[in-house]
């Protein structure tokens, strides 16, 4: 058993049929010695008396808020949560496996630049009685500070018969140098509590590996005289690290109709302009990627050919 | 020791070209190592990230773009910083700092060159003959060093008398390649910045 936060405790259980469970001793936080009784949740049934209560925790029915009273007055609470371990593996029932970039990916994180700010998100089908708490650091043995905000519900989607909820959190490394060469990864830890179930999820990464620039901005077209060719120009996104001559991007320019299966014109360039062939009912799209360290491409920025 | 916005040395462009070749060569070599050594811990997640140049050179700091010298976090590890009060730096100081930066890059290359050559000598003794260093990568390191045109003492190639542990050597190769790729990215960024300045 360990303390998650004040008056909230996590009991780690090996979860299999007829498991013996864990013996837990609760102590009432009071100077009083006599006349103390214990109850669980809203029930008025007295579970025991005395300053300590020993219980055998085997299942979710044994978890919950234990309260010690004296003469009708509440003295203190202890909330017990369960963390299940099945076949030596901690349960991952609360969050959905995003399976990208690999199986057992519950947390996904992205950074728009090298400033040390990044966003992580996760998915669940659970809509109520759900709380998250996020901690992060650079390295684990001698951790350096990363400050994370509160996790918030950022999107709701319908997937078949199910609703899916996306939560996200923003974090900022306390003292980040954009030009630094990372040797210790960022660690992100998410505590998830659903009703009386506790689970924790972790992700470890270098900022350089989770870079995904914003799309290029200010796309403009200039038709070339006596030609079907069009000069398309754009600018670096505002959120990208500066100076741009140090943090350079490379671009992919594509002309394509509405369907992905349609024919297309595609060219890669390090410049902020390119010449392509425009077709009726097609769009010109441009996306960006770090020129020197190939992490993710940005989303497309698009303008219609006409 | 930060890079100011300065008139580029006319000989900078060949360095940019060589640094692009360097990044390409080390990236290819790293990819080859990850494929060939698939049953060894050779991915970014599996290895310890060591920097053989730590405390010996200070390329990131010496080559910091002027725009980043206002960032306290970039100056943390530096004993000296050449920020002046708002105005541009005198050209003498400019070329002095650029020289500091480029000589730091040169020293990095020299250290990695020695490590790689020593390692290759060990890998050539491996009866499995599983992996060797790409001669192209070693040649590209050499070309960039020549383009930088610094004279410095030759570092003797380390020779060891004991029987090499090939498993450890291959893991060391992965560690070295990952670190060198990261440094090659920095070098490429620096050359691009200098070329544009």
């Amino acid at each position: 058993i360990w303390e998650l936060k004040k008056d909230v405790y996590v009991v780690e259980l090996d979860w299999y049929p007829d498991a013996p469970g864990e013996m837990v001793v609760l102590t009432c936080d009071t100077p009083e010695e006599d006349g103390i009784t214990w109850t669980l949740d809203q029930s008025s049934e007295v579970l025991g008396s005395g300053k300590t209560l020993t219980i055998q925790v085997k299942e979710f029915g044994d978890a919950g808020q234990y309260t010690c009273h004296k003469g009708g007055e509440v003295l203190s609470h202890s909330l017990l949560l369960l963390h299940k371990k099945e076949d030596g593996i901690w349960s991952t029932d609360i969050l959905k496996d995003q399976k990208e970039p690999k199986n057992k990916t519950f947390l996904r994180c992205e950074a728009k630049n090298y400033s040390g700010r990044f966003t992580c998100w996760w998915l669940t089908t659970i809509s109520t009685d759900l709380t998250f708490s996020v901690k992060s650091s650079r390295g684990s043995s001698d951790p350096q500070g990363v400050t994370c905000g509160a996790a918030t519900l950022s999107a709701e989607r319908v997937r078949g018969d199910n609703k899916e909820y996306e939560y996200s959190v923003e974090c900022q490394e306390d003292s980040a140098c954009p030009a630094a060469e990372e040797s210790l990864p960022i660690e992100v830890m998410v505590d998830a509590v659903h009703k009386l179930k506790y689970e924790n999820y972790t992700s470890s990464f270098f900022i350089r590996d989770i870079i995904k620039p914003d799309p290029p901005k200010n796309l403009q077209l200039k038709p070339l005289k006596n030609s079907r060719q069009v000069e398309v120009s754009w600018e670096y996104p505002d959120t990208w690290s500066t100076p741009h001559s140090y943090f350079s991007l490379t671009f992919c320019v594509q002309v394509q109709g509405k369907s992905k299966r349609e024919k297309k014109d595609r060219v890669f360039t390090d410049k902020t302009s390119a010449t392509v062939i425009c077709r009726k009912n097609a769009s010109i799209s441009v996306r960006a990627q770090d020129r020197y360290y190939s992490s993710s491409w940005s989303e497309w920025a698009s303008v219609p050919c006409s | 020791r930060n890079l100011p916005v300065a008139t580029p040395d006319p000989g900078m462009f060949p360095c940019l070209h060589h640094s692009q070749n360097l990044l390409r060569a080390v990236s290819n070599m790293l990819q080859k190592a990850r494929q060939t050594l698939e049953f060894y811990p050779c991915t970014s997640e599996e290895i310890d990230h060591e920097d053989i140049t730590k405390d010996k050179t200070s390329t990131v700091e010496a080559c910091l773009p002027l725009e980043l010298t206002k960032n306290e976090s970039c100056l943390n590890s530096r004993e000296t910083s050449f920020i002046t009060n708002g105005s541009c730096l005198a050209s003498r100081k400019t070329s002095f700092m650029m020289a500091l930066c480029l000589s730091s890059i040169y020293e990095d290359l020299k250290m990695y060159q020695v490590e790689f050559k020593t390692m290759n000598a060990k890998l050539l003794m491996d009866p499995k003959r599983q992996i060797f260093l790409d001669q192209n990568m070693l040649a590209v390191i050499d070309e960039l060093m020549q383009a930088l045109n610094f004279n410095s003492e030759t570092v003797p190639q380390k020779s060891s008398l004991e029987e090499p542990d090939f498993y450890k050597t291959k893991i060391k190769l992965c560690i070295l390649l990952h670190a060198f790729r990261i440094r090659a990215v920095t070098i490429d960024r620096v050359m691009s910045y200098l070329n544009a300045s």
Epitope: Q229, E262, K263, K264, R266, V267, F268, I277, R279 | -
Partner: antibody, heavy 118, light 107 residues
Framework: QVQLVQSGAEVKKPGSSVKVSCKAS????????LHWVRQAPGQGLEWMGW????????EYAPKFQGRVTITADESTSTAYMELSSLRSEDTAVYYC???????????WGQGTLVTVSS | DIVMTQSPLSLPVTPGEPASISCRAS??????LHWYQQKPGQAPRQLIA???QSISGVPSRFSGSGSGTDFTLTISSLQPEDFATYYC?????????FGQGTKVEIK
């Protein structure tokens, strides 16, 4: 299976014209760009131009501008390349080729040998 | 026009050995570079798109690398069926241009 079948070999006199055809099967004809590339005996590949069969748009290499005409007939899924004012150095195998991507080629025809000789 | 220069023009290789062909562009073309293989009496066949993207159906022993002006096609272990002429082609700008070809011959 995508296939491009070209017309047979031709022998032409200098100053005349040649029209080579290329019939496509497998896939929708207008879903692809069609290119013409030639190869002189023992020489390398030389790009001549492309056509978008959907709208008839064409682009020619400056070297052939004014001498080459690429057309397409959607009803028969056939593309044509006509080269005029032939000279001996136009002796080559002429390939039609196609791709959904404009700037490179993934499927080639078998080639048509055009010999220009007096 | 962008001029593509291949080297060597002829490359004698022992079967089972690796081979590398170089292609250089007269100006920077990013990764807009494609590789083709041509056997005598046959049409070319696509091997690599955009400098390093493998094409389905092409054996994994063929790989490409490079960007800017310098590109390489590598065959990790030459098989008897790989003896052919190899061409690079730039797609950075029109007109599309090819290298002059590299003939890989049995040593």
């Amino acid at each position: 299976q995508v296939q491009l079948v070209q017309s047979g070999a031709e022998v032409k006199k200098p100053g005349s014209s040649v029209k080579v055809s290329c019939k496509a099967s497998g896939g929708t004809f207008s879903d692809y760009y069609l290119h013409w590339v030639r190869q002189a005996p023992g020489q390398g590949l030389e790009w001549m131009g492309w056509i978008d069969p959907e709208n008839g748009d064409t682009e020619y290499a400056p070297k052939f501008q004014g001498r080459v005409t690429i057309t397409a007939d959607e009803s028969t899924s056939t593309a044509y390349m006509e080269l005029s004012s032939l000279r001996s150095e136009d002796t080559a195998v002429y390939y039609c080729a196609r791709n959904k991507e404009l700037r490179y080629i993934d499927v080639w025809g078998q080639g048509t040998l055009v010999t220009v000789s007096s | 026009d962008i001029v593509m220069t291949q080297s060597p023009l002829s490359l004698p290789v022992t079967p089972g050995e690796p081979a590398s062909i170089s292609c250089r562009a007269s100006q920077s073309i990013s990764i807009n570079l494609h590789w083709y293989q041509q056997k005598p009496g046959q049409a070319p066949r696509q091997l690599i798109a955009f400098a390093s993207q493998s094409i389905s159906g092409v054996p994994s022993r063929f790989s490409g690398s490079g960007s800017g002006t310098d590109f390489t096609l590598t065959i990790s272990s030459l098989q008897p069926e790989d003896f052919a002429t190899y061409y690079c082609q730039q797609s950075n700008s029109f007109p599309l241009t090819f290298g002059q070809g590299t003939k890989v011959e049995i040593k």
